[in-house]
C-alpha cells in the first residue's frame, strides 16, 4: 500500500514538475527590466528564451521573436537545449511511469517489469529536473554577470550633458517557476526510485521438497533464491545517482539585450 502511494505521489509530483518546466520554457519573463534605478519608466521590457517583449503603460504589449539561430548567444542556446532535453526526458518518463503504476494492470505484466519501469522513469525524472535546474541556473548566472557589468557603465553620456540610462535586467518569474518545477521533478524522480525498491519481488524461499531416490534417503533443500532483477536487498551493486553538482568557474558574458531580430 505504502509503495503504491509513494509511486503515485512520485508520479503526480513529477507531472506537476514537468508541467512547470514546460510553462517556464514557454514563458516570456525569464528576465525583466530592473526598475530600481528607473521606477518612473512608462515602458517595461522583459525577455524569454524565444522572444523579447515590451509592455507600454498604455496597455499595449509588443513581442518580437528571435528569428535567428546563429545570431543568438551560445549561452541562450545552451539554456534552450537544457530545457528542451528536460521536457523530452520528462515526457518519456511520464509515459513510462504510467505503465509502471501499480494501480494500473496491463496484461500479465510482472512486478519485476514494473519495478524496472519505475526505476527508469525515476531516473528520467531526476535527469529532467537537473536539466531544468541547470538551465535556469545558467540563465540566472548570465543575468547576474550582466547586471553588474551594466551597473559598472550604467550612465554613458555625451560630455556629461545627455544621459542614456542602460536597461538592466533582473530575475523574471520564469526563473522561479523553473527552479520550483525542476525541484519537484527531481523529488518525484527520487520518490519513483524509492517506490521501485518496494515493487521488486522479495526473496522467495521455496519449501523443502524430498526426493526419494531408490536406495538412498537424501533430502534436497535448495538455498534461498534471490530474484535476479538486481533490486533485492543486495547492497553490493547498489548505485548512488549523484546529481553532479557543478561549479561555474568561468564568468559568462552575456549581452543585456539579446533580441537579435
Amino acid at each position: 500500500m505504502a509503495v503504491t502511494a509513494c509511486q503515485g505521489l512520485g508520479f503526480v509530483v513529477s507531472l506537476i514538475g514537468i508541467a512547470g518546466i514546460i510553462a517556464a520554457t514557454c514563458m516570456d519573463q525569464w528576465s525583466t527590466q530592473d526598475l530600481y534605478n528607473n521606477p518612473v519608466t512608462a515602458v517595461f521590457n522583459y525577455q524569454g528564451l524565444w522572444r523579447s517583449c515590451v509592455r507600454e503603460s498604455s496597455g499595449f504589449t509588443e513581442c518580437r521573436g528571435y528569428f535567428t539561430l546563429l545570431g543568438l548567444p551560445a549561452m541562450l542556446q545552451a539554456v534552450r537545449a537544457l530545457m528542451i532535453v528536460g521536457i523530452v526526458l520528462g515526457a518519456i518518463g511520464l509515459l513510462v511511469s504510467i505503465f509502471a503504476l501499480k494501480c494500473i494492470r496491463i496484461g500479465s505484466m510482472e512486478d519485476s517489469a514494473k519495478a524496472n519501469m519505475t526505476l527508469t522513469s525515476g531516473i528520467m525524472f531526476i535527469v529532467s529536473g537537473l536539466c531544468a535546474i541547470a538551465g535556469v541556473s545558467v540563465f540566472a548566472n548570465m543575468l547576474v554577470t550582466n547586471f553588474w557589468m551594466s551597473t559598472a557603465n550604467m550612465y554613458t553620456g555625451m560630455g556629461g550633458m545627455v544621459q542614456t540610462v542602460q536597461t538592466r535586467y533582473t530575475f523574471g518569474a520564469a526563473l522561479f517557476v523553473g527552479w520550483v518545477a525542476g525541484g519537484l521533478t527531481l523529488i518525484g524522480g527520487v520518490m519513483m526510485c524509492i517506490a521501485c525498491r518496494g515493487l521488486a519481488p522479495e526473496e522467495t524461499n521455496y519449501k523443502a521438497v524430498s526426493y526419494h531416490a531408490s536406495g538412498h534417503s537424501v533430502a534436497y533443500k535448495p538455498g534461498g533464491f534471490k530474484a535476479s532483477t538486481g533490486f533485492g536487498s543486495n547492497t553490493k551493486n547498489k548505485k548512488i545517482y549523484d546529481g553532479g553538482a557543478r561549479t561555474e568557474d568561468e564568468v559568462q558574458s552575456y549581452p543585456s539585450k539579446h533580441d537579435y531580430v
Epitope: A42, V43, T167
Partner: antibody
C-alpha cells in the same frame, strides 16, 4: 467612433473644489488608461498624470501631487479629475486623453475651461 | 524629469514651403527592448484639443497626411512638413512618452507670412 466628452466650463472661487468629468464611448473603457493634461491660457501643455482604469491606480506628476485626485465610475465609463483648494493659477483648460500606441494620446476630450476668480 | 526643448519657438512660412522643426530631449528616448523611440508629435489649432500626428518618433497616425514626417533617434528629433498648407498653421508639440512625467516641449508655432 471613439469619443471623450468632457463636462462644461466651471467658474470657481479660490479655495473651492472642482470636479471635471470625462465620459468615454466607442471602446472598452477598462482597456485603456486615461491621462489628464492642463493648458493655461496662451501656454503649452502640461501632463498632470494618468489613471489605470483596470486597477484604478493613479499616477500624478510631482507638481500636481497633493491637490489633485483622479477617480473613476467604471459602470458609467467616466473618469474624473478633482482639484482641491483652487488657486488663480489653476485657471486653465483641462483635457482628458486616452492612451494609444507608443504611450501617445490619439483621443482627446474637447477640454473643460476652469476659471478661478475671486 | 526629461526636459524637452523645441526650436524654433515660431516659424513664418509660405504655402508650399518645406518646414523643419526640432525637438531635443535631455535623456535618450530610445528603448533598447524594441529599438523604438518614445517620442510623439502633436498639432494644436486655436480652441481645439491637440491632434496626434506622429508616435514612436516616425510612425504616422492613421488619417494624417503624408506630408508630415517624423525622424530622429535617441535625443534629437525632427518633424518635417514637406509642403505647408494653410490648414497646417498651428502649434506643434513634441512629447516624451518614455519616462514619467510625460513631459511636453514648449511648442513651435507655425505662422503665415
Amino acid at each position: 467612433q471613439i469619443q471623450l466628452a468632457q463636462s462644461g466650463p466651471e467658474l470657481k472661487k479660490p479655495g473651492e473644489t472642482v470636479k471635471v468629468s470625462c465620459k468615454a464611448s466607442g471602446y472598452t473603457f477598462k482597456n485603456y488608461g486615461m491621462n489628464w493634461v492642463k493648458q493655461a491660457p496662451g501656454k503649452g501643455l502640461k501632463w498632470m498624470g494618468w489613471i489605470n482604469i483596470n486597477t484604478g491606480e493613479p499616477r500624478y506628476a510631482e507638481e500636481f501631487k497633493g491637490r489633485i485626485a483622479f477617480s473613476l465610475e467604471t459602470s458609467a465609463s467616466t473618469a474624473y479629475l478633482l482639484i482641491n483648494n483652487l488657486k488663480n493659477e489653476d485657471t486653465a483648460t483641462y483635457f482628458c486623453a486616452r492612451y494609444g500606441y507608443g504611450n501617445s494620446f490619439p483621443y482627446w476630450g474637447q477640454g473643460t475651461l476652469v476659471t478661478v476668480s475671486a | 524629469d526629461i526636459v524637452m526643448t523645441q526650436s524654433p519657438s515660431s516659424l513664418t512660412v509660405t504655402v508650399g514651403e518645406k518646414v523643419t522643426m526640432s525637438c531635443k530631449s535631455s535623456q535618450s528616448l530610445l528603448n533598447s527592448g524594441n529599438q523604438r523611440n518614445y517620442l510623439t508629435w502633436y498639432q494644436q489649432k486655436p480652441g481645439q484639443p491637440p491632434k496626434l500626428l506622429i508616435y514612436w518618433a516616425s510612425t504616422r497616425e492613421s488619417g494624417v497626411p503624408d506630408r508630415f514626417t517624423g525622424s530622429g533617434s535617441g535625443t534629437a528629433f525632427t518633424l518635417t512638413v514637406s509642403s505647408v498648407q494653410a490648414e497646417d498653421l498651428a502649434v506643434y508639440y513634441c512629447q516624451n512618452d518614455y519616462s514619467y512625467p510625460l513631459t511636453f516641449g514648449a511648442g513651435t508655432k507655425l505662422e503665415m507670412k
